[in-house]
């Protein structure tokens, strides 16, 4: 490639998490080159025999790809010229977790960076009033989590209160025998209060809020991936 190997270019990755069964992104950027044909992108996974993905001379070169990644990877070919070497990983598997290396060769030099990729399942919780219950009860449900998360209830009025004695959480294995449905019930709920159902594992943290007043019910939920850092 016409380079001595002594020049190094800056390559930057971001640790990320993949939701199993869905598509994921392994992020990698580098100092761009003016000619696409001079750029080589290699993705490797520590411990895996073949390459995860290779892009060279403006196109994918998959003859050395490991079979565990066959048909599941793609780079954003139109963005390579501006320094985007990120990899799209289709149908994320639990076994995709591990350490990846984004290795770049350009006419300016070579560079690489590692990233930790975690895999699991995470989903947004939904909190509803359970009208079938004998007392005022809230029901928090999230369809897909793995590994098994913890569930903690909190309330705006009773800040710092421990609701473990008045709540019950169950985990039901989904049909694919990996992920689980999370159901948590909170009893003895008071009106004019905001309750939060917080679900967390080592990959993600999700919160479902519900505000119950005599006239209305307001819901809000959000999900945050943990340990996503450069």
């Amino acid at each position: 490639f016409g380079i001595s190997g002594r020049h190094s270019i800056t390559v930057t990755t971001v640790a990320s998490a993949g939701n199993i069964g869905e598509d994921g992104i392994l992020s990698c950027t580098f100092e761009p080159d003016i000619k696409l044909s001079d750029i080589v992108i290699q993705w490797l996974k520590e411990g895996v025999l073949g390459l995860v993905h290779e892009f060279k001379e403006g196109k994918d070169e998959l003859s050395e790809q490991d079979e565990m990644f066959r048909g599941r990877t793609a780079v954003f070919a139109d963005q390579v010229i501006v320094g985007n070497a990120s990899l799209r990983l289709k149908n994320v598997q639990l076994t995709d977790a591990g350490t990846y290396k984004c290795y770049i060769i350009t006419s300016k030099g070579k560079g690489n960076a590692n990233l930790e990729y975690k895999t699991g399942a995470f989903s947004m919780p939904e909190v509803n009033v359970d009208y079938n219950a004998s007392s005022e009860t809230l029901r928090c449900e999230a369809p897909r989590w793995f590994p098994q998360p913890t569930v903690v209830w909190a309330s705006q009025v009773d800040q710092g209160a421990n609701f473990s004695e008045v709540s019950n959480t169950s985990f039901e294995l989904n049909s694919e025998n990996v992920t689980m449905k999370v159901v948590s019930v909170l009893y003895n709920v008071t009106i004019n209060n905001t309750y939060s159902c917080m679900i967390e594992n080592d990959i993600a943290k999700a919160t479902g809020d519900i505000k119950v007043t005599e006239s209305e019910i307001k819901r809000r939920s959000h999900l945050q991936l943990l340990n996503s850092k450069a």
Partner: antibody, heavy 117, light 107 residues
Amino acid sequence: EVQLLESGGGLVKPGGSLRLSCAASGFTFSSYAMHWVRQAPGKGLEWVAVISYDGSNKYYADSVKGRFTISRDDSKNTLYLQMNSLKTEDTAVYYCARHGWDAFDIWGQGTLVTVSS
Amino acid sequence: DIQMTQSPSSLSASVGDRVTITCRASQDISNRLNWYQQKPGKAPKLLIYLASSLQGGVPSRFSGSGSGTDFTLTISSLQPEDFATYYCQQAISFPLTFGGGTKVEIK
């Protein structure tokens, strides 16, 4: 500490069998492909066999194909090499090695196999 | 099979010398080339992977370069602990193959 420790070497007659073991510690064994590499006395390095991280793929050097079998037991963090129909030219120090970034990044100390009548 | 040819097979050098070892592959192996150091009675040790990436813990006086069929291992300033045998290895296809080795001896 990341470590590989081979055992099972020894003196065996031509046509005999031997099973080598390689005990791994200090890393997630089940995430790594593993290799066997050998070195005949006073000679260079020769790759023998590899097994993928999940055991689904195995590759062998032509010189051992049909005689040697590589296997792994992730529950015991152990790699194996079953050697049958041994020949005098199989005499060597056998190393197990971890597959890191496209290379043998961690090596065991080796175990000597001597095939002689 | 891909043949790996190392040269020289042996060399004599002094402490502080710049040493260069070459490795040639019988066909294009891109950057899938590794270098190892082996001392008598010891297991080999990985120095360089992917042709030019320095393995963690390896002194920066070791460097690798090349792509395609021609590769070089350079020791910028030879130290007493560097006297050993060095091997290149291709990692692009099975069977994986090593060069014949280069023995670096004290002059």
